[in-house]
Amino acid sequence: FEIALPRESNITVLIKLGTPTLLAKPCYIVISKRHITMLSIKSGERIVFTFSCQSPENHFVIEIQKNIDCMSGPCPFGEVQLQPSTSLLPTLNRTFIWDVKAHKSIGLELQFSIPRLRQIGPGESCPDGVTHSISGRIDATVVRIGTFCSNGTVSRIKMQEGVKMALHLPWFHPRNVSGFSIANRSSIKRLCIIESVFEGEGSATLMSANYPEGFPEDELMTWQFVVPAHLRASVSFLNFNLSNCERKEERVEYYIPGSTTNPEVFKLEDKQPGNMAGNFNLSLQGCDQDAQSPGILRLQFQVLVQHPQNESNKIYVVDLSNERAMSLTIEPRPVKQSRKFVPGCFVCLESRTCSSNLTLTSGSKHKISFLCDDLTRLWMNVEKTISCTDHRYCQRKSYSLQVPSDILHLPVELHDFSWKLLVPKDRLSLVLVPAQKLQQHTHEKPCNTSFSYLVASAIPSQDLYFGSFCPGGSIKQIQVKQNISVTLRTFAPSFQQEASRQGLTVSFIPYFKEEGVFTVTPDTKSKVYLRTPNWDRGLPSLTSVSWNISVPRDQVACLTFFKERSGVVCQTGRAFMIIQEQRTRAEEIFSLDEDVLPKPSFHHHSFWVNISNCSPTSGKQLDLLFSVTLTPRTVDLT
């Protein structure tokens, strides 16, 4: 190999050992029979050398540094050449370094031809191995602007006072052009400006200077985004830290097209703007840090550019001004992440503050819009609390548990609407009366409606789930002892059409001791399946539940249990089941932890089934499933 560097070229070539490998045989640079491990070639020198091994790329790297001095004379602006040409260099991993020094008042601009650059974070690498490391200078201090790969959006980087650009090319890479040019600009009066150009939909992740270390104190850095006017951009902060400021405040500023309040100033912890049309700028401003405990300012953010949806121009009014103790959250439904670019899906408040989730609270009217390619990616969860504090005022008072029409008119699917029903302890209980009788969801007879009511205790220490209930069954009402949550959960978009079937009334009633009472009025046509609360986990310790089962005069009810033994093993106490005829008060008592369950029995009159649990041993819980079937009486037994 022969490398000849022209005089005054300000180029230095250095060939040195790379990262040591576990190769058995060492390799040397051979110059006139001398074996060396490092070779430095300066401007005006010509050196001929060879390597002592077949694959020097496994041992050596080459660095070509060109110092460009813009302080003492004119700057060689324009397209930057790879000198010496890659064809003249040995096939080693090579790094071309351009170190440009300029006056503080001079702005320098690196312009990248297509493909543009994509910034990578710590620990990331470029697929093709080609990396661009760019740093600037503040007085004598080097500041890392970032490390970049090809195929991105970064088209220009402006700095002042100097720039150092390192282009790393793997030994096998055929690239023979630098891919960038240098131009001079007037002073930019900040650390740097990074321009990011979007041709179409896409995303870019960018980082503050020195990331993940701290951004230089009291500095300003700007990102200019070029976005086609027909697209929309949204900013989200992926990671940030704030330093301890002594003077001034760390902030981000946006210049947004069409905004009357430019610059718009945001704290880093604020929701960042979305749904921005066309070009915009984002600047990060540091502060004067506390000398004793400076902390670090750092920021990693993402800009997502996508087509506006039809919905993004539509404003939806959600009027919660007459609601109390209610919150509505629109959020992404859980999905498996795919590796390809997925357009963002945002919900915007007043068209500007866009984020992937949004919570609206009662007491106000809210205007929202959507910036989303597919609204099925979002769903709504609503929580409303109905509480009674004064038992004298609440007793017999009723509330309708219905999803407000404003919510049903939103173009996003309702997932859960939860009512938290709170009563004064040991003073009042609750009764739920559905507009349409309910069916309890069981494995034997699952619900196939577009929605269900999930009824569970709302007492934090109590793990009690009464079950899932849907319209079209035999349960006429559910009475519960204390605080519960009733959640209307939808399972299909057809809920919008079936919304009229929803409707549950809750009333506050005098306190009773049983955990729950189900009133069941079976239809002659079908078998009613009923199961104890907390199925799969077992009825909680010392809990009692009852079923009040009506039998019409001309019918006989067959009560059937689906296993021979309850399976419960009591640690303390005994578990009982009492079946009581309501007319005669005659009762059958079964010790569930000791005896077999009853064989199918026939009841000519309405009857109670009461189940009271003991304190079971773990793993031996009380779970019972039973059915009631009506058949016509053949003989008058009255």
Epitope: S544, T572, R574, I578, S591, C614
Partner: antibody, heavy 124, light 107 residues
């Protein structure tokens, strides 16, 4: 009114057998667990055995385990205690007692109604 | 097994007075304790269960208290028919066990 009437007591030689019966009335017999409790002359009460309402579970004091068997016939409203390999220390008045159903109830049994007792004497 | 110890073995009190009988368990029985009264030549009668709940038909002068290992049966004002034997019984664990009894006699 709950009534419990024991029968089958008497004098038996050590190693002999005896079967006590307890006829129940005034309540739904199958709903309630039943127990046998004995009282040796001049001594305190000692629980002997118990059986659940449908006969699915039985319990014994260590002193009688393997020798006594409790059973019930719900169709006849009758409780039994079959006593084999009797010993002198089994001499006592044997009471049958009805369990109280308290919900939630303790594991063991509380006896809210008692028979008048059947005397068993084991002597040679 | 759980050993139940009653004290005193005999208690002498005047009619109309207040009296307290004690029952101690060798290990905790929670509130699973009953008190019985036995008159000479008769079967026992349930007075209290659950440590403090009076059985049906039992006069209010009888009251029970305690939990864990220490229990008491209190008579607010002794009547002549109360001077008989009293037993405590634990039903927290098998086997069921009784105390040895306390005889209440007229002073």
């Amino acid at each position: 009114e709950v009534q419990l009437l024991e029968s089958g007591g008497g004098l038996v030689q050590p190693g002999g057998s005896l079967r006590l019966s307890c006829a129940a009335s005034g309540f739904t017999f199958s709903n309630y667990a039943m127990s046998w409790v004995r009282q040796a002359p001049g001594k305190g009460l000692e629980w002997v055995s118990a059986i659940s309402g449908r006969g699915g579970s039985t319990y014994y004091a260590d002193s009688v385990k393997g020798r006594f068997t409790i059973s019930r016939d719900n169709s006849k409203n009758t409780l039994y205690l079959q006593m084999n390999s009797l010993r002198a220390e089994d001499t006592a008045v044997y009471y049958c007692a009805k369990d109280i159903v308290v919900v939630p109830a303790a594991k063991g049994y509380v006896m809210d109604a008692w028979g008048q007792g059947a005397s068993v004497t084991v002597s040679s | 097994e759980i050993v139940m110890t009653q004290s005193p073995a005999t208690l002498s009190v005047s009619p109309g007075e207040r009296a307290t009988l004690s029952c101690r368990a060798s290990q905790s029985v929670s509130s699973n304790l009953a008190w019985y009264q036995q008159k000479p030549g008769q079967a026992p009668r349930l007075l209290i269960y659950g440590a403090s709940t009076r059985a049906t038909g039992i006069p209010a002068r009888f009251s029970g208290s305690g939990s864990g290992t220490e229990f008491t049966l209190t008579f607010s004002s002794l009547q002549s028919e109360d001077f008989v034997v009293y037993y405590c019984q634990q039903y927290n664990n098998w086997p069921l066990t009784f105390g040895q009894g306390t005889r209440l006699e007229i002073k």
